[in-house]
């Protein structure tokens, strides 16, 4: 679909005569008839196959035709066509004299013709005008013409319909050849597919408008390249949606069971060494000078009573210092300047001379110790409490404060998890390092043998002669359904043969 446009520019008829040579009275009131038809080697009369158009009277004798496209569209003249432009044409332009106001062909005398020109040739679709001038003996016509496509038609012959659109069936404008030119952000044959955010995962992401990245179920992240782990997954990851692959040191379905308490919580204080010993369980090995479950307690270096001979101990940042009583000296007040003559032994200790009276030694009564029998015996010095128990002096006696899981005077006994008979239905209890285990009797299961499981009494195939076996779930016994011809609790006897009883 397109339009053949003809722009009349100037007509010269200086003598004001008709084609017959006869003058017009009072002058030649000139209008034009245009015939557009298919290409003919010799342009001949006949149907105007591409269309016709007529003008009103445009002037008298000689005149210029002004461009009137804005005021009614009479010039250029429009010859629309609704077919593929063939690229060739024939054009006939006739100038006529109008004696009156009726311009219909049948209303005009045949000799009212002023001039007739006929041209033919090739013409490509395009915006450029072709200028031409045709001269006869008496007249001259200057004009230009072109073929353009109608709105929304494109291509070399105006055969391609294309309408720009911007809806969900396409986001495009039309190129000169009629092909689609996608608007920014759109792609596809019809420009209806949005170009997603750069990097948006091809399979796991999609978009409904440009630069968007919407995630399919199971995926997340700006580019939909991160899987969503199982709901409730605490310390785990996934490589495909709904997985929960535990991080190192974590276990369980949701990776919420701590298998590496040491690393995750650093419970041991003061540079102690931590060892994992099960789920949420650990042991701290303290550095010298520290004690407690988490090595959180600082041991006083004076606690070991290093000062002898009644010397008093003072804690210092870098150790301790002994203040010696008169007659003693040395790091631990171990050297004496006394002899037995000075009665150095306290608490009823007896003095013995040594080295020809230059030194002495005290023999202490029970419950006292020290080079001068000055110390009450500390019953905790031998570290009698086992399994990390804490020793406490209680007057003349001592006691051990045991760590959880241990008991006995010296914390030497492991508390038995089996002591409270946790296994139900006669299950046998076994103490383990981190708990207990129940061995269940037949017919029971579960961690504490608390679940009753039916014994399949039919498992041993007790019924004979192809009888059907049924388990009585209430008594865990079986019942045999005998086929025809057999009797007995196990269908072991044929009918007619009485059982042979031993009595």
């Amino acid at each position: 679909s397109g339009v053949f446009q003809l722009q009349l520019q100037e007509f010269i008829n200086e003598r004001g005569v008709l084609a017959s040579g006869r003058p017009c009275e009072p002058g030649c009131r000139t209008f034009f008839r245009v015939c557009l038809k298919h290409f003919q080697a010799v342009v001949s009369p006949g149907p105007c196959t591409f269309g016709t158009v007529s003008t009103p009277v445009l002037g008298t004798n000689s005149f210029a035709v002004r461009d009137d496209s804005s005021g009614g569209g009479r010039n250029p003249l429009q010859l629309p066509f609704n077919f593929t432009w063939p690229g060739t044409f024939s054009l006939i332009i006739e100038a006529w004299h109008a004696p009156g106001d009726d311009l219909r062909p049948e209303a005009l005398p045949p000799d009212a013709l002023i001039s007739k020109i006929a041209i033919q040739g090739s013409l490509a679709v395009g915006q450029n005008w072709l200028l031409d001038e045709q001269t006869s003996t008496l007249t001259r016509l200057r004009y230009s013409y072109r073929v353009i496509c109608s709105d929304n038609y494109y291509g070399d012959n105006c055969s391609r319909l294309c309408k720009k659109r911007n809806d969900h069936f396409g986001h495009y404008v039309c190129q000169p050849d009629g092909n689609l030119s996608c608007l920014p952000g759109w792609t596809g044959e019809y420009c209806q597919q949005p170009i997603c955010l750069s990097g948006c995962h091809e399979q796991n992401g999609y978009c409904s408008k440009p630069a968007e990245c919407l995630c399919r179920p199971g995926w997340q992240g700006r580019l939909c390249n991160e899987c969503i782990p199982h709901n409730g997954c605490r310390h785990g990851t996934c490589s495909t949606p709904w997985q929960c692959t535990c991080d190192e040191g974590w276990g369980g379905l949701f990776c919420d069971q701590d298998l590496n308490y040491c690393t995750h919580h650093s419970p041991c204080k003061n540079g102690a060494t931590c060892s994992n010993s099960g789920q949420r369980s650990y042991t701290c090995t303290c550095r010298p000078g520290y004690t407690g479950v988490d090595c959180e307690l600082e041991l006083s270096e004076c606690d070991s009573n290093p000062c002898r001979n009644g010397g008093s101990c003072k804690d210092q940042e870098d150790g301790y210092h002994c203040l010696c009583p008169p007659g003693y000296y040395g790091l631990h007040c171990e050297h004496s300047t006394l002899s037995c003559a000075d009665s150095p032994c306290f608490n009823g200790g007896s003095c013995r001379e040594r080295n020809q009276g230059a030194n002495y030694a005290c023999e202490c009564p029970p419950n006292f110790t020290g080079s001068n029998c000055e110390k009450k015996v500390d019953r905790c010095t031998s570290n009698p409490c086992a399994n990390g128990g804490q020793c406490l002096n209680r007057g003349p006696s001592r006691m051990c404060r045991c760590r959880p899981g241990f008991t006995g005077t010296y914390c030497e006994l492991h508390v038995s998890d089996c002591a409270r008979n946790p296994c139900a239905h006669g299950g046998t209890c076994h103490d383990l390092e981190n708990g207990l285990m129940c061995t269940c009797p037949a017919g029971f299961s579960g961690r504490r043998c608390e679940v009753r499981t039916s014994i399949d009494a039919c498992a041993s195939s007790p019924c004979f002669n192809r009888a059907t076996c049924y388990t009585d779930l209430s008594t865990d016994t079986f019942v045999c359904n005998c086929p025809y011809g057999f009797v007995g609790s196990r269908c072991e006897f044929p009918v007619g043969l009485p059982p042979s009883f031993p009595w």
Epitope: D151, N152, L161, K163, K164, R165, N166, D167, H168, F169, G170, G188, E189, Y190, Q192, Q193, Y206, C207, S208, L214
Partner: antibody, heavy 121, light 104 residues
Framework: EVQLQESGPGLVKPSETLSLTCTVS??????????WGWIRQPPGKGLEWIGD???????YYNPSLKNRVTISVDTSKNQFSLKLSSVTAADTAVYYC?????????????WGQGTLVTVSS | SYELTQPPSVSVSPGQTASITCSGE??????VSWYQQKPGQSPVLVIY???MRPSGIPERFSGSNSGDTATLTISGTQPMDEADYYC?????????FGSGTKVT
């Protein structure tokens, strides 16, 4: 050849939600060349476009119904569905599902046979 | 909202040409589809993109669209062409149907 089949209750009470499903057979609903639409026709009246959906889930609705209508797609079942809430007697119509073709400029080249939904108490 | 206007009815003698118009603002800048609907049946697409015929639609159906008016022409009308005809266009993401024309 692609066939479309509407299904759902033929009677809905006023103020309730109308729910219809369109099952596509003989072709994939995940084809990028089509939108899947719902059109209705009250008895003795003309056609009214309700809305449509792409296989990715992108939806487009008639503004006159937008706050009441929801269209969804289930590519695994090759189905798409219509929900219209707060219905009144004016929503009584034959409801059609249709395939709108991108290559045909949005022309609906395949229609279901239609299902009459009556809104009445 | 965008509206498409059709004459309620068009009468034509068998063998003659029926022309159904569809008017809307700058309709020529939009693609128009035409549907035929016979009583008790679903609509059938007879013209898409103004003038294109889907396969299986007889050549007597043709369409044009320019300015504010699209036209469906049935040349050599047959009794079987008696039906309701609807034009349809897309206006900014929304499908719009004409009011329908009964051809008898």
């Amino acid at each position: 050849e692609v066939q479309l089949q509407e299904s759902g209750p033929g009677l809905v009470k006023p103020s309730e939600t109308l729910s219809l499903t369109c099952t596509v057979s003989g072709g994939s609903i995940s084809s990028g060349s089509y939108y899947w639409g719902w059109i209705r026709q009250p008895p003795g009246k003309g056609l009214e476009w309700i809305g449509d959906i792409y296989y990715t889930g992108s939806t487009y609705y008639n503004p006159s119904l937008k706050n009441r209508v929801t269209i969804s797609v289930d590519t695994s079942k090759n189905q798409f569905s219509l929900k219209l809430s707060s219905v009144t007697a004016a929503d009584t119509a034959v409801y059609y599902c249709a395939r709108e073709s991108v290559p045909l400029g949005g022309g609906a080249d395949n229609w279901g046979q239609g299902t009459l939904v009556t809104v009445s108490s | 909202s965008y509206e498409l206007t059709q004459p309620p009815s068009v009468s034509v003698s068998p063998g003659q040409t029926a022309s159904i118009t569809c008017s809307g603002e700058s309709l020529g800048d939009k693609y128009v589809s035409w549907y035929q609907q016979k009583p008790g049946q679903s609509p059938v697409l007879v013209i898409y993109e103004d003038s294109m015929r889907p396969s299986g639609i007889p050549e007597r159906f043709s369409g044009s669209n320019s300015g504010d008016t699209a036209t469906l022409t049935i040349s050599g009308t047959q009794p079987m062409d008696e039906a309701d005809y609807y034009c349809q266009a897309w206006d900014s993401e929304v499908g719009v149907f004409g009011s329908g024309t009964k051809v008898t």
